[in-house]
Every structure is written in C-alpha cells, then in structure tokens.
Amino acid sequence: HTAAQDNCTCPTNKMTVCSPDGPGGRCQCRALGSGMAVDCSTLTSKCLLLKARMSAPKNARTLVRPSEHALVDNDGLYDPDCDPEGRFKARQCNQTSVCWCVNSVGVRRTDKGDLSLRCDELVRTHHILIDLRHRPTAGAFNHSDLDAELRRLFRERYRLHPKFVAAVHYEQPTIQIELRQNTSQKAAGDVDIGDAAYYFERDIKGESLFQGRGGLDLRVRGEPLQVERTLIYYLDEIPPKFSMKRLTA
C-alpha cells in the first residue's frame, strides 16, 4: 500500500491512521472504524469512508429527467458493513435488527425488513446523475469551458477515467454531470463512479476527504463556480424493489 513515505500519511484519505508497520517497514494506512488497510494511491471506497465517518466524529442542451427508477439517498448516514474488499455488503442492518438491501453506492433499494430479509447480490449502480445549482453569476458559464473543467476535475482530482464521464449538461443555473460505468466496463484499477461521486459530493460540501489539500476551488476561465445545491440520483443495473405504498407516497 503506497503512502507518503517521509511523514507517513495518506494523500487520498484523511480518515486514516498511518504507521510504518507495512511490509519492510513501509508506511501502511488503515481506515478509521474498520481498520482495513487502504491503497493511498487511489480513492478509498465509499463504504470504508462512511464507516470511518461514523466512527469519528442525452441532448447536450437539455437537462436529464431522472428515470422513475432513480434512487436518491434519503436515509442519510449509517454505519455500514463492508466486505473484505471495502465494498458495501448487499444487506445492511442496524442495531435494532432492521435490515435492507443496498446498491453498490450504499443507497437503500428495498423496503426495510427484519433479519430474514435476503439480498442475493450487490446490485451495481451503473449511472449516477449529479445535479448542481450554482450561485448567481454575472453571466452564464460557457458550456464548453464548464464541460472541460468538470471533466478535468474528475480526471485529475478523482482519477476517474474520462470515458466514465458520459455528459455534462448546463442550463443556467443548473449543471448536471452524468457518470456511467457498467460492470463490464470497469477494469481492475479503475476508480468506481460511486466513489468518485462521493468524493465530489464531500468536496462540494466543503468536507474534503483529501489529506492536507486545500478545499475544492472550482473555476471556469477564472470565474469561481460556487455550488448552492446538490442532488445525486443513482440508477441501478436492476431496478429497485419498493412496495407500492412507498412509490405512491
């Protein structure tokens, strides 16, 4: 596991404890909460980040209408169970034995049940729609410049391969970033779109997960891009299973 050798820290995850007790005395960083060793050369999985957080304190000019199956994370924070690779376990339960199934980004995709609830597989979230509203500016941003800046951000800051940023839509003041990544497209070593979206969400909220880096300073042609509202929609490879009662509520 790589980490900055000189002072043994994890550049990509401040929610770690690092010590020179890895193989050969190399720096090894463990995520708070889980104690799992993390690879500091890339993003840490959202599951481990949530666990750490709980332990510490189409048409270019048209906005996308989220699918009827799109999920929004309304449940907020919880202390998740992560598998040995740091991914969300398909079934999550709380202290009172209430259980539910989640997708690969940890968002609930079924009604809540008891310990008998079965979640056969971890369903992959293959499409993420990040919906932003920016603060008023003198004029609209140039769409091409905005597109280029956001793609650069995801490539350089979050190490997400450019092919997974499907589109950037803009109708002032709303910006939409579409991330797409099918199971078959994701190769070993590729950053997961769910992890990139989570790092971006925390950056936008001024809660950067990066060690020692300044907060996110988004600029388009020198003009600050200040976000005042964020909504993230998650679309799974298999539609979620909620009862009709919830769908009509």
Partner: antibody, heavy 117, light 107 residues
Framework: EVQLVQSGAEVKKPGASVKVSCKAS????????INWVRQAPGQGLEWMGN????????NYNQKFKDRVTMTRDTSTSTVYMELSSLRSEDTAVYYC??????????WGQGTLVTVSS | EIVLTQSPATLSLSPGERATLSCRAS??????IAWYQQKPGQAPRLLIE???ESISGIPARFSGSGSGTDFTLTISSLEPEDFAVYYC?????????FGGGTKVEIK
C-alpha cells in the same frame, strides 16, 4: 533492543477497576500501534483493542467497549489499559504487544489480573 | 467480525515428523494472517507474517502458505522445542481476531 515492560500482578474485587501499564523502549514509541491481548487460564488469545500513541487514536473490541480505556503518556513512552466493572471471568493474563507489519512482533511479559471476592 | 477456525485442535506427532496446521477465515482476508507459537507461562512468539513471510530469528523449518480464506503453517521436521500451542491471527480489519489454537503434542 525493543522491550515492553508491564506492571506487576494485581488482585481485585468484583466491580473494581484495574489499570495495567506497559512501558516501551528501543524504538520510536509514537510510530507503532500498541495492542492489548488477554488470555484467561487454559484459554486462547483474545484481542481487546489498540492505541496509536502518536495521536491517541483508540479502537476497542466491541466486547470490551463500555469497560476498557486505553491511554498513553508520550513523556514516559508508556501505554495504559484500564478495565472497569471487573468480574470473575476477567481473571486472565493481560499482554501488551507492539504491532509490526502483519503481526504482533514484540510482547510484554504479561500481567496476571485475578478477580476474586 | 472475522472468525478464524483452526484445525486440528490437537496434533500428536513425534520429533522429526512434519506438522501441518490449518487456519480457515470466515471471509476473504487476502494474506493478512500471522502465526504464533506459545509455550506455557510465556508470551506468544511471532513466527510468520503476511501468511508466508518468515520472521528473522525464526528457524527455517517454519513456513506459511495460503491466501483468501485458507492458510497453513508447516513445520517441516519437528524439534523437541516445537511442542507448543500455535495460533493464527488476522489483521485484515478490526477487531483483530485469533484462532482457537492448535496444540502440537508429543506422541
């Protein structure tokens, strides 16, 4: 030479607390985790938790979470493990251990804590 | 938590024989396993780390193998001082856990 020297044996009454110390020498105290492991008579090893002396970050085994407190004093390179609300089943040898790589490479000599009325 | 199951509980062998001890994890832990030897009245002694990496000062007759969920400690030829209890321990995630131990006794 790396050494972990623990405090002496203790006899306590049920409901009392015990505080065991572990003094480290021969390495950079703040750079390595210190773990606490206990072993009841004739039983196996049980991990209680650990502390990272550099910043006092602690992590406890859920089983002991409400009763155990681990602290450190960097000026004396000493780590402490306090266990409260003692019961007879807490009778055991308590070891401190310095964590290296994937294993607990260095161990204290052990401290026998006997809980008896 | 990750449960480690060691087998057999007791292994009766003669000096010079080969000892094979098994440790099975309840879930994939890669190679995050260590092996210890413990003699009566003594603290455990680290023998192997990262499933197969030997520790300096430990005799070459001790070797480890395995990854994922199945791990093995092998003592190629038992010496009289090797009769003891052996524990595996995982450090994949907290809480760190130990196996129940395998006692290697003289036949």
């Amino acid at each position: 030479e790396v050494q972990l020297v623990q405090s002496g044996a203790e006899v306590k009454k049920p409901g009392a607390s015990v505080k065991v110390s572990c003094k480290a020498s021969g390495y950079t105290f703040t750079s390595y985790w210190i773990n606490w492991v206990r072993q009841a008579p004739g039983q196996g090893l049980e991990w209680m938790g650990n502390i990272y002396p550099s910043n006092s970050y602690t992590n406890y085994n859920q089983k002991f979470k409400d009763r155990v407190t681990m602290t450190r004093d960097t000026s004396t390179s000493t780590v402490y493990m306090e266990l409260s609300s003692l019961r007879s089943e807490d009778t055991a040898v308590y070891y401190c251990s310095s964590y290296r790589s994937d294993g607990f490479a260095y161990w204290g000599q052990g401290t026998l804590v006997t809980v008896s009325s | 938590e990750i449960v480690l199951t060691q087998s057999p509980a007791t292994l009766s062998l003669s000096p010079g024989e080969r000892a094979t001890l098994s440790c099975r994890a309840s879930q994939n832990i890669g190679t995050s396993i260590a092996w210890y030897q413990q003699k009566p009245g003594q603290a455990p002694r680290l023998l192997i780390e990262f499933a197969s990496e030997s520790i300096s000062g430990i005799p070459a007759r001790f070797s480890g193998s395995g990854s994922g969920t199945d791990f093995t400690l092998t003592i190629s030829s038992l010496e009289p001082e090797d009769f003891a209890v052996y524990y595996c321990q995982q450090s994949n995630s907290w809480p760190f856990t130990f196996g129940g131990g395998t006692k290697v006794e003289i036949k």
